[in-house]
Amino acid sequence: MMTGTIETTGNISAEKGGSIILQCHLSSTTAQVTQVNWEQQDQLLAICNADLGWHISPSFKDRVAPGPGLGLTLQSLTVNDTGEYFCIYHTYPDGTYTGRIFLEVLESSVAEHGARFQIP
């Protein structure tokens, strides 16, 4: 039975041109995390495999940095980056857990800076 839960930053906002850390955390399970996939609705951003390291999709190579940890740092934000992001945890023996983050990229300095994993 899958007992784990994914904690995410939930809804976060950031300024255009700035950076944001997308971070999820799997808790309440002893399952081994074998891989984490980071996705938007219709495309892959990156994969972190416990053994093989990072894969970053070519469309994001210039502005995505691996980490910290299993998270992902998204740089040079544009308003087009607004939307849903998903962390998909592949675990053994539990299977797959999915977390959701909604990012809003704002035009001006009205972005909140209170999100737990956000870069100021």
């Epitope: 495309q43 892959l44 093989l52 894969h55």
Partner: antibody, heavy 119, light 107 residues
Framework: QVQLQQPGAELVKPGASVKLSCKAS????????IYWVKQRPGQGLEWIGG????????NFNENFKSKATLTVDKSSSTAYMQLSSLTSDDSAVYFC????????????WGQGTLVTVSA | DIVMTQSHKFMSTSVGDRVSITCKAS??????VAWYQQKPGQSPKLLIY???YRYTGVPDRFTGSGSGTDFTFTISSVQAEDLAVYYC?????????FGGGTKLEIK
């Protein structure tokens, strides 16, 4: 330029083991994973597994976990795959491949080693 | 394991024709798909990845598209040298898997 050099062929007896080599040149060996792919005569491609040369970590296709051992020798920029308890099903061409920068896709391929298992 | 299905084992075409090869994943693989070309007696070569990026030096007659479970590889104007087997492959989750291959035959 990037090169992955593999011996052309190995003839081995059933039940024996064989250690295949893949010598890398033209890039920093520890910066890119090495993967191994099997192709039986006239058949398709099958991913065996990969090794991260910087730390020796390996990831296997479950079908090959008890068949293949992946290692690296950083000093000679060489990756190895040992195949054990060989049977006729192991007769195939074995390719070593290398990924792209931060990419899992197989950008560079060796010429392949033909392993023939025969008494 | 994720199964990658190439519905056509063989495809016959003429020089100058447009040809499309399809690949269907048994489950979601996002855009983690690549296409390889293998000519007789040679190692495979990376043509397309992620799944619409042309690899260095690959002619622009080769294109790819798709997301999720359905992927297409297209040669806009087939040349005689395109005689080969074409494989799709997913790297969304291990074990990474290939399609069975589609052999392109020139009429």
């Amino acid at each position: 330029q990037v090169q992955l050099q593999q011996p052309g062929a190995e003839l081995v007896k059933p039940g024996a083991s064989v250690k295949l080599s893949c010598k890398a040149s033209g890039y920093t060996f520890i910066s890119y994973n090495i993967y191994w792919v099997k192709q039986r005569p006239g058949q398709g491609l099958e991913w065996i597994g990969g090794v991260n040369p910087s730390n020796g970590n390996t990831n296997f296709n479950e079908n090959f976990k008890s068949k293949a051992t992946l290692t690296v020798d950083k000093s000679s920029s060489t990756a190895y795959m040992q195949l054990s308890s060989l049977t006729s099903d192991d007769s195939a061409v074995y390719f070593c491949t290398r990924g792209n920068y931060y990419g899992y896709e197989f950008a560079y391929w060796g010429q392949g080693t033909l392993v023939t298992v025969s008494a | 394991d994720i199964v990658m299905t190439q519905s056509h084992k063989f495809m016959s075409t003429s020089v100058g024709d447009r040809v499309s090869i399809t690949c269907k994943a048994s489950q979601h693989v996002s855009t983690a798909v690549a296409w390889y070309q293998q000519k007789p007696g040679q190692s495979p070569k990376l043509l397309i990845y992620s799944p619409s990026y042309r690899y260095t030096g690959v002619p622009d007659r080769f294109t790819g598209s798709g997301s999720g479970t359905d992927f297409t590889f297209t040669i806009s104007s087939v040349q005689a040298e395109d005689l080969a087997v074409y494989y799709c492959q997913q790297h969304y989750s291990t074990p990474w898997t290939f399609g069975g291959g589609t052999k392109l035959e020139i009429k």
